[in-house]
């Protein structure tokens, strides 16, 4: 039971956490224009993976999207690359996640392929989610960088009458969407993968035979143990001695795998 | 057919109150902003204030203490409130409809003309 | 604040001129993320309130005459007016949009 949960509690919360991702990789406000130093501006900038907005006070807001492909950043190319895997390894883990579910009957599917799948899941959610805080976290580098950087360029040159404010970005609402839809698929796959663990069959599958002493001599048949291991004929087998040793099928006619000495 | 009209006193007397009542017809006072601009006789356009489809307002810095527009959106009414008037507040007072664009001022009322005196 | 200066305060044409009219602002006006200019024009003839005429810097409202043209970048800017007809007679002023409070120029003054 508590497998289970664990297991459909992890598929939710990793559920969240890639509609989160791509939720974030879809925002305009990956960066926002900040207002310290212009509090009073009647437009407002802000930015995001694939375009790039203003919006005015009156209400018009235009948005342009970024058309170039070579002319874009490397580190923003890096973080589109990083957020995109993230919710191809999301979306895959969900779909191999949905199969792996205790509650969901398919075929006669072993619980040995179950736990495979949900710790496949596991995993995928985990890089997932790795995937999508490295990205949104590159991206939190580079805005701190450039901030300084404005900073630093904002107050050289001020010398004549004509003051040219520089537009200084910082964090959007996308990078705490991100940071925590990562956070949120990254707590999924562990779930998962500590869900595989009660999944996993135990792995003693065998036969025991057990000997008891006798007093007297024992004709043993040739042969006679031979359908003991449990994985040969359906078969009873025969008794072929009065004492000293019986087989475990004579309690339990088929092979199970929850034999024990 | 945009229009705006201002509705004011005319006369006030020095440190009383302005209110002027500018009623708009032909849009939503949800969708676009209300500018009040002023202007001394014989002088040039001053600025006062504006109060947007969201409500949100923005002041002239020289007359924040003293300033205050509000609205009422189900009665097309926008509202300018100028506290402690001096004689250099004799204005041509006009309300002016924000364009949605380039937060510029596409639609003008005729003006109230205001004398402070006593 | 923004501060606009205008110049000339006034001028006097002959109609048919071309006339140009300068506008100057104490900080840029372009903002980065569209490079769009924030500056309007407006025409006032006499005993009438303003009218829009440009906004944008550059971008004419509808119904204005294509002889009306404005133009410059950053923290100067030119208003020209091709072919001047007497029904331009009137005080152009220019405003900053950009940032509050919006501030007006002081106007320049058309005589024909």
């Known amino acids: 039971m508590a497998v289970t949960a664990c297991q459909g509690l992890g598929f939710v919360v990793s559920l969240i956490g890639i509609a989160g991702i791509i939720a974030a990789t879809c925002m305009d406000q990956w960066s926002t224009q900040d207002l310290y130093n212009n509090p009073v501006t009647a437009v407002f900038n802000y930015q995001g993976l694939w375009r790039s907005c203003v919006r005015e006070s009156s209400g018009f807001t235009e948005c342009r999207g970024y058309f170039t492909l070579l002319g874009l950043p490397a580190m923003l190319q890096a973080v589109r690359a990083l957020m995109i895997v993230g919710i191809v390894l999301g979306a895959i883990g969900l779909l191999v996640s949905i199969f792996a579910l205790k509650c969901i009957r398919i075929g006669s599917m072993e619980d040995s392929a179950k736990a495979n799948m949900t710790l496949t899941s596991g995993i995928m959610f985990i890089v997932s989610g790795l995937c999508a805080i490295a990205g949104v976290s590159v991206f939190a580098n580079m805005l701190v960088t450039n901030f300084w950087m404005s900073t630093a360029n904002m107050y050289t040159g001020m010398g004549g009458m004509v003051q040219t404010v520089q537009t200084r970005y910082t964090f959007g609402a996308a990078l705490f969407v991100g940071w925590v839809a990562g956070g949120l698929t990254l707590i999924g796959g562990v779930m998962m993968c500590i869900a595989c663990r009660g999944l996993a069959p135990e792995e003693t599958n065998y036969k025991a035979v057990s000997y008891h002493a006798s007093g007297h001599s024992v004709a043993y048949k040739p042969g006679g143990f031979k359908a003991s291991t449990g994985f040969g004929s359906n078969t009873k087998n025969k008794k072929i001695y009065d004492g000293g040793a019986r087989t475990e099928d004579e309690v339990q006619s088929y092979p199970s795998k929850h034999d024990y000495v | 057919q945009v229009q705006l009209k201002e509705s004011g006193p005319g006369l006030v007397a020095p440190s009383q109150s302005l209110s002027i009542t500018c009623t708009v017809s032909?849009?939503?006072?949800?969708?676009?902003?209300i500018n009040w601009v002023r202007q001394p006789p014989g002088k040039g356009l001053e600025w006062l204030g504006v109060?947007?489809?969201?409500?949100?307002?923005n002041y002239h810095s020289a007359l924040i203490s003293r300033l205050s527009i509000s609205k009422d959106n189900s009665k097309s009414q926008v509202f300018l409130k100028l506290n402690s008037l001096q004689t250099d507040d004799t204005a041509t007072y006009y309300c002016?409809?924000?364009?949605?664009?380039?937060?510029?001022?596409?639609?003008w009322g005729q003006g109230t003309s205001v004398t402070v005196s006593s | 604040d923004i501060v606009m200066t205008q110049s000339p305060s006034s001028l006097t044409v002959t109609a048919g001129e071309t006339v140009t009219m300068s506008c100057k602002s104490s900080?840029?006006?372009?903002?980065?993320?569209?490079?769009?200019?924030?500056l309007t024009w407006y025409q006032q003839k006499p005993g009438q309130p303003p009218k829009l005429l440009i906004y944008?810097?550059?971008t004419r409202e509808s119904g204005v005459p294509d002889r009306f043209t404005g133009s410059g970048s950053g923290t100067d800017f030119t208003l020209t007016i091709s072919s001047v007809q007497a029904e331009d007679l009137a005080v152009y002023y220019c405003?900053?949009?950009?940032?509050?409070?919006?501030?007006f120029g002081s106007g320049t003054k058309l005589e024909i």
């Open positions: 002016v409809k924000s364009s949605y664009y380039g937060n510029a001022m596409d639609y």
């Open positions: 032909g849009f939503s006072l949800t969708t676009y902003g």
């Open positions: 109060i947007w489809g969201d409500g949100s307002t």
């Open positions: 900080q840029s006006l372009l903002n980065s993320g569209n490079q769009k200019n924030y």
């Open positions: 944008w810097a550059s």
């Open positions: 405003q900053n949009v950009y940032s509050y409070p919006f501030t």
